[in-house]
């Protein structure tokens, strides 16, 4: 995918730089497996520079390929608590709206561990809203060094 | 955060590009949980291009948002090694100096696993020194494909 | 490493931007521990923009420092199956050709878990072919949100 001549002439900032790193705000109500995120300097080291939050979900404002990364740590957890539960705890990151673009991008299970962490490159479009669904009965930690979610625009 | 007109005119190299990938040199003496790192082409595939090492700890030389990543593998471990020991083995990456900016950025425990790997975006400032603290009784592997630590400047 | 004056004058696209995100196609025949990858919009969200596939292995076309990342999830897996099997499962990412540059870049074992995920920065050269070796008797999942492999050029 080539940059247009117009893009080549524009200042660097116009090419992207969109970036966000979020911290956990709260979990959803019953029947809502989504994690709700927050970001901003007043909250600590989280920030939003380009993407937006829509009711705790991350919305993309610029088309491009993004590096999406996440770490989630379970709050009260031992190596047996994750395997003791009938329904294993699973985290999935996906596009949840618009519905026409709904897809799971990243999925991990907490087998005998208490933390999952991963990252991937994926094309995202303006208006895509990313949801992070945590299924299971264990609660996530809200410590900002244990649970976080971020995206980084890397190329058009 | 917009780029100034001056920044827009400067060659790309002036915008950042600071990057480092380090390999484990040694662990700390008694009462010092820090891992000590080394980097440079003579050592293999590790390198420092911008950031510096100060007594085995990584010091940032350019303000910006960085992607920080780490993988640590224990030299011996098991499904029971972490539970056999009273104090679970934990890795924390944080700013350790200047003291006024001291904070934990990334924390993971080795629950029934032998490797942790994660990454996050975080704002760092010139002069920030990053420390990686490994607590517990198990030794880290020094194999360069199993244990490494790096940062990448991604935007101002 | 400075950019040459010529590089500074060229449009941004000439500086790199090489990037790929691949999905699992199939495993190798007996005695071949390599995973075989595929990519392209017709397949879903995988893509190759610069790097190429050579018989399912990723070949680099531009010198530079790359962020290499991978996630592999085992298909039929419980927290005990990884330890119960006679052949423990390990994943290694490395340069497999040219032979003169053969080296392991990233190695992880599935201890009592069913997913590994990691990333690292590493210098790669035009013509380097990356192989991902999965040793053991457990099969990887081909779900595109569970198993993927990618590289991103980050600087010269």
């Amino acid at each position: 995918q080539r940059l247009s001549r117009a893009q080549q002439q524009l200042p660097l900032e116009s090419l992207g730089w969109d970036i966000a790193e979020l911290q956990l705000n709260h979990t959803g109500p019953q029947q809502d497996p989504r994690l709700y995120w927050q970001g901003g300097p007043a909250l600590g080291r989280s920030f939003l520079r380009g993407p937006e939050l829509d009711k705790g979900q991350l919305r993309i404002r610029r088309d491009g390929i993004y590096m999406v990364h996440i770490q989630v740590t379970l709050a009260i957890c031992s190596s047996t608590s994750t395997s003791r539960h009938h329904h294993p705890t699973t985290l999935a990151v996906g596009i949840c709206s618009p519905a026409s673009r709904s897809i799971s991008l990243l999925r991990l299970s907490f087998h005998q561990g208490c933390t999952i962490a991963s990252q991937r490159l994926t094309p995202l479009a303006r208006g895509d809203t990313l949801c992070t669904n945590l299924t299971g009965t264990l609660l996530p930690s809200r410590n900002t060094d244990e649970t976080f979610f971020g995206v980084q625009w890397v190329r058009p | 955060q917009r780029l100034s007109r001056a920044q827009q005119q400067l060659p790309l190299e002036s915008l950042g590009w600071d990057i480092a990938e380090l390999q484990l040199n040694h662990t700390g003496p008694q009462q010092d949980p820090r891992l000590y790192w080394q980097g440079g082409p003579a050592l293999g595939r590790s390198f420092l291009r911008g950031p510096e090492l100060d007594k085995g700890q990584l010091r940032i030389r350019r303000d910006g948002i960085y992607m920080v990543h780490i993988q640590v593998t224990l030299a011996i471990c098991s499904s029971t090694s972490t539970s056999r020991h009273h104090h679970p083995t934990t890795l924390a990456v944080g700013i350790c100096s200047p003291a006024s900016r001291s904070i934990s950025l990334l924390r993971l425990s080795f629950h029934q696993g032998c490797t942790i790997a994660s990454q996050r975006l975080t704002p760092l400032a010139r002069g920030d020194t990053l420390c990686t603290n490994l607590t517990g009784t198990l030794l880290p592997s020094r194999n360069t494909d199993e244990t490494f630590f790096g940062v990448q400047w991604v935007r101002p | 490493q400075r950019l040459s004056r010529a590089q500074q004058q060229l449009p941004l696209e000439s500086l790199g931007w090489d990037i790929a995100e691949l999905q699992l196609n199939h495993t190798g025949p007996q005695q071949d521990p390599r995973l075989y990858w595929q990519g392209g919009p017709a397949l879903g969200r995988s893509f190759l923009r610069g790097p190429e596939l050579d018989k399912g292995q990723l070949r680099i076309r531009r010198d530079g420092i790359y962020m290499v990342h991978i996630q592999v999830t085992l298909a039929i897996c419980s927290s005990t199956s990884t330890s119960r099997h006679h052949h423990p499962t390990t994943l290694a990412v490395g340069i497999c050709s040219p032979a003169s540059r053969s080296i392991s870049l990233l190695r992880l074992s599935f201890h009592q878990g069913c997913t590994i995920a990691s990333q690292r920065l590493t210098p790669l050269a035009r013509g380097d072919t990356l192989c991902t070796n999965l040793t053991g008797t457990l099969l990887p999942s081909r779900n595109t949100d569970e198993t993927f492999f990618g590289v991103q050029w980050v600087r010269p």
Epitope: - | Q31, Y36, C77, S81, G136, S141 | S109, H111
Partner: antibody, heavy 120, light 108 residues
Framework: EVQLLESGGGLVQPGGSLRLSCAAS????????MSWVRQAPGKGLEWVSV????????DYADSVKGRFTISRDNSKNTLYLQMNSLRAEDTAVYYC?????????????WGQGTLVTVSS | EIVLTQSPGTLSLSPGERATLSCRAS???????LAWYQQKPGQAPRLFIY???SRATGIPDRFSGSGSGTDFTLTISRLEPEDFAVYFC?????????FGQGTKLEIK
């Protein structure tokens, strides 16, 4: 040439104490993790304790935990094992052993051993 | 703790013959972290094989290691007089590391 030379063994009564030393030469001692491994007369080998290159991390076999203390003095290229509350079952030849550079728990060089006999 | 069982306890062979020593683990451990040592009477153990199949420095190529998971083998393709000794296997994948009870290789 890598050399490890143990000393300090001997006869001691149950409940007594002993301090073993291991003098290292021929390599950069401060760059390697070290372990003590023992072998009861006519028996197999048993790992006892490990210490990291700089001395900040130690670990022990359950059979000696709380009674033995491993330490090192990198300025003297010497490894130590302080053994307290000794029992008859601690009778063995004690070897100091160097870990592979990767820190993996296999041992590429061993000393000749020193015999500890715990008996009344 | 992983228990390593070596067999046979004693192996009687003649120089020039092929020796096959077995080491079986009570559970599998990661990445083939198994070593073999040779010990002669009154001497310290000497590392021969690590990583299940890699020969240590100075070990002749008549010695080879194989296996993975729970079953490992040390093979001496053609016995020399100096090869008669006790051989111990050791796993170093799971804490605590542990040793087999040894196989005595004696001259027939």
């Amino acid at each position: 040439e890598v050399q490890l030379l143990e000393s300090g063994g001997g006869l001691v009564q149950p409940g007594g104490s002993l301090r073993l030393s291991c003098a290292a030469s021929g390599f950069t001692f401060s760059s390697y993790a070290m372990s003590w491994v023992r072998q009861a007369p006519g028996k197999g080998l048993e790992w006892v304790s490990v210490i990291s290159d700089s001395g900040g991390t130690t670990d022990y076999a359950d059979s000696v935990k709380g009674r033995f203390t491993i330490s090192r003095d990198n300025s003297k290229n010497t490894l130590y094992l302080q053994m307290n509350s000794l029992r008859a079952e601690d009778t063995a030849v004690y070897y100091c052993a160097r870990h592979d550079y990767s820190n993996r728990y296999y041992f590429d060089y061993w000393g000749q051993g020193t015999l500890v006999t715990v008996s009344s | 703790e992983i228990v390593l069982t070596q067999s046979p306890g004693t192996l009687s062979l003649s120089p020039g013959e092929r020796a096959t020593l077995s080491c079986r683990a009570s559970q599998s451990f990661s990445s083939n972290y198994l070593a073999w040592y040779q010990q002669k009477p009154g001497q310290a153990p000497r590392l021969f094989i690590y990583g299940a199949s890699s020969r240590a420095t100075g070990i002749p190529d008549r010695f080879s290691g194989s296996g993975s998971g729970t079953d490992f083998t040390l093979t001496i393709s053609r016995l020399e007089p100096e090869d008669f000794a006790v051989y111990f296997c050791q796993q170093y994948g799971i804490s605590p590391c542990s040793f087999g009870q040894g196989t005595k290789l004696e001259i027939k």
